[in-house]
């Protein structure tokens, strides 16, 4: 999950494998101030998971979340 410094969440590692799409309710991008660009997926249990925005499954999930 993202590490929060001065209320700016940043990610230092990415989950590599896909999360179940049905478990994800929303997402957000971390700040440009963070050293690693990241997408944070928020699960239905309100857990936050860092993901690599360049991964295919991450892009696919973002697209489907935008459309829903």
């Amino acid at each position: 999950s993202p590490y929060s410094s001065d209320t700016t969440p940043c990610c230092f590692a990415y989950i590599a494998r896909p999360l179940p799409r049905a478990h994800i309710k929303e997402y957000f991008y971390t700040s440009g101030k963070c050293s690693n660009p990241a997408v944070v997926f928020v699960t239905r249990k309100n857990r936050q998971v860092c993901a690599n925005p360049e991964k295919k499954w991450v892009r696919e999930y973002i697209n489907s979340l935008e459309m829903s």
Epitope: Y14, A16, R17, L19, T43, K45, K55, E60
Partner: antibody
Framework: QVQLVQSGAEVKKPGASVKVSCKVS????????MHWVRQAPGKGLEWMGG????????IYAQKFQGRVTMTEDTSTDTAYMELSSLRSEDTAVYYC????????????WGQGTTVTVSS | SYVLTQPPSVSVAPGQTARITCGGN??????VHWYQQKPGQAPVLVVY???DRPSGIPERFSGSNSGNTATLTISRVEAGDEADYYC???????????FGGGTKVTVL
């Protein structure tokens, strides 16, 4: 180095249940998502389901929904797969396989447990 | 649910190149993993995320993914490469891992 050691072969009668165990050594079970895959004699690999640690939930393949239960005992670093209402078509080698959180793909597999269903 | 199609068998002479295909609708939009399974043994991951190799896997194993076909290529084939090979993808519509039917590689 992580290793998965599974329980021994089982012979069951139709209608019975079987519970296969998979012990993790070298790491703690918390470090992994554990999946279960089976292979019938002379057939291909079939994914049965797996644990999603980020959500504390288990996902099951539709085919096995209601008949399979996957559990984990973190105190002993052991995962379990129980399949009920066994039929002859369930005769297969059952594998546990790890899906490490920050590495794609099923990197480490157990040695397999042969389950034979026969009357 | 998502279907992956592999040829049942591929034959190749030692030293030559084996290409194993894995077909699926718009498979290029998915990350493909490949496993090698020798008789009586558990599968081994040889390529992940289309073209990356786990440590310990020879450079002779490579992968690609375009259009409706992903391909595992084994260069300079050796007798020890004789095995069954399976492709695998994540199907986000069903939240299931899906395996191809497997391809038996025979070294002549």
């Amino acid at each position: 180095q992580v290793q998965l050691v599974q329980s021994g072969a089982e012979v069951k009668k139709p209608g019975a249940s079987v519970k296969v165990s998979c012990k993790v050594s070298g790491y703690t079970l918390n470090d992994f998502a554990m999946h279960w895959v089976r292979q019938a004699p002379g057939k291909g690999l079939e994914w049965m389901g797996g644990y999603v640690p980020e959500d504390g939930d288990t996902i099951y393949a539709q085919k096995f929904q209601g008949r399979v239960t996957m559990t984990e005992d973190t105190s002993t670093d052991t995962a379990y797969m129980e399949l009920s209402s066994l039929r002859s078509e369930d005769t297969a080698v059952y594998y546990c396989a790890t899906d490490p959180l920050y590495t794609p793909g099923l990197y480490v597999w157990g040695q397999g447990t042969t389950v034979t269903v026969s009357s | 649910s998502y279907v992956l199609t592999q040829p049942p068998s591929v034959s190749v002479a030692p030293g030559q190149t084996a290409r194993i295909t894995c077909g699926g609708n718009n498979i290029e939009s998915k990350s493909v993993h490949w496993y090698q399974q020798k008789p009586g043994q558990a599968p081994v991951l040889v390529v992940y995320d289309d073209s990356d190799r786990p440590s310990g896997i020879p450079e002779r194993f490579s992968g690609s993914n375009s259009g409706n076909t992903a391909t595992l290529t084994i260069s300079r084939v050796e007798a020890g490469d004789e095995a069954d090979y399976y492709c695998q993808v994540w199907d986000s519509n069903t939240d299931h891992w899906v395996f191809g039917g497997g391809t038996k590689v025979t070294v002549l």
